[in-house]
């Protein structure tokens, strides 16, 4: 079944942008001016998820790349990774659970909770130039709030 998708950028609540760091990792850092063109453009898709009153299930792909953010166990710890997929089959309405994030929107701030690992969130560090990761705490040192801006093609 076809899915609704959009193209966007994400910035954390400290206004750090997300950029590629090697082929399979994202990092967060402050960008200005022409450097803003480095930021990753996501293709966010509305997918099937578990029923909820305040969470919207989405998948986060990298625009025009066959890469999706996914959540897997590594060394017994929930971990965020970029995973290659067959572009002929993605995005799809019924995404595998590791690709699904529950988008939680409060006061124009977005959180992305892993559907596979409840209460684990896409996170950034306070420090500059550090990897984007899956964090198990909210409201602590690490940042779990993001803002989204549409990208015009």
């Amino acid at each position: 079944a076809p899915v609704r998708s959009l193209n966007c950028t994400l910035r954390d609540s400290q206004q750090k942008s997300l950029v590629m760091s090697g082929p399979y990792e994202l990092k967060a850092l402050h960008l200005q001016g022409q450097d803003m063109e480095q930021q990753v453009v996501f293709s966010m898709s509305f997918v099937q998820g578990e029923e909820s009153n305040d969470k919207i299930p989405v998948a986060l792909g990298l625009k025009e790349k066959n890469l999706y953010l996914s959540c897997v166990l590594k060394d017994d710890k929930p971990t965020l990774q970029l995973e290659s997929v067959d572009p002929k089959n993605y995005p799809k309405k019924k995404m595998e659970k590791r690709f699904v994030f529950n988008k939680i929107e409060i006061n124009n701030k977005l959180e992305f909770e892993s559907a596979q690992f409840p209460n684990w969130y896409i996170s950034t560090s306070q420090a500059e130039n550090m990897p984007v990761f899956l964090g198990g705490t909210k409201g602590g040192q690490d940042i779990t709030d993001f803002t989204m801006q549409f990208v015009s093609s």
Epitope: S5, S52, F150
Partner: antibody
Framework: EVQLVESGGGLVQPGGSLRLSCTVS????????MSWVRQAPGKGLEWIGI???????YYASWAKGRFTISKDTSKNTVYLQMNSLRAEDTAVYFC?????????????WGQGTLVTVSS | EIVMTQSPSTLSASVGDRVIITCQAS??????LSWYQQKPGKAPKLLIY???TLASGVPSRFSGSGSGAEFTLTISSLQPDDFATYYC??????????FGQGTKLTVK
Amino acid sequence: EVQLVESGGGLVQPGGSLRLSCTVSGFSLSSYAMSWVRQAPGKGLEWIGIIYDSASTYYASWAKGRFTISKDTSKNTVYLQMNSLRAEDTAVYFCARERQIFSGDMDGWGQGTLVTVSS
Amino acid sequence: EIVMTQSPSTLSASVGDRVIITCQASQSIDNWLSWYQQKPGKAPKLLIYRASTLASGVPSRFSGSGSGAEFTLTISSLQPDDFATYYCQNTGGGVSIAFGQGTKLTVK
């Protein structure tokens, strides 16, 4: 305060074209999706389509081809281009804001603009 | 495309009555359903989203329930301001968003 104001409605001949505008304030089109919905006289609500970013638009099956939604974020304005108009397109046309991205529901509406297709 | 069917099409009731409007989807939409109220010459107003969550500023006499393909809107004690037309809306089935045909609530 969230405000949406439609304009551009009026009388148009069958086969003609019309472009409606929806100017918004109190929020940014760079982070909210916008739908167009119409209502023929004495009839129910009919969803036309929705725009996210400029490249991501979705339409009701009956609207594909004749109706095009676009936007100019710098002007805070969303447009509905209507071509090959027919008598049955006579309706009040509303723009509406999606409450949250992909929520599908609409928490802010304009007052509507009337389009009459008649010779 | 998913078709939304409301019943009844018209409903006569009195102030203080308990009113129930139903909405059926042609296939399961989980809880992706909203309800709107519309008065003549006005824009619709969002009442309920995700089948059961009350929108901001909506009185608690309104409630929604259901999941899958069967949904209901209940007004526990009808007030004079509630006479209007009510629409259900599928918000999550595929790429398309569809409204029911409406239920007109009139004074008995």
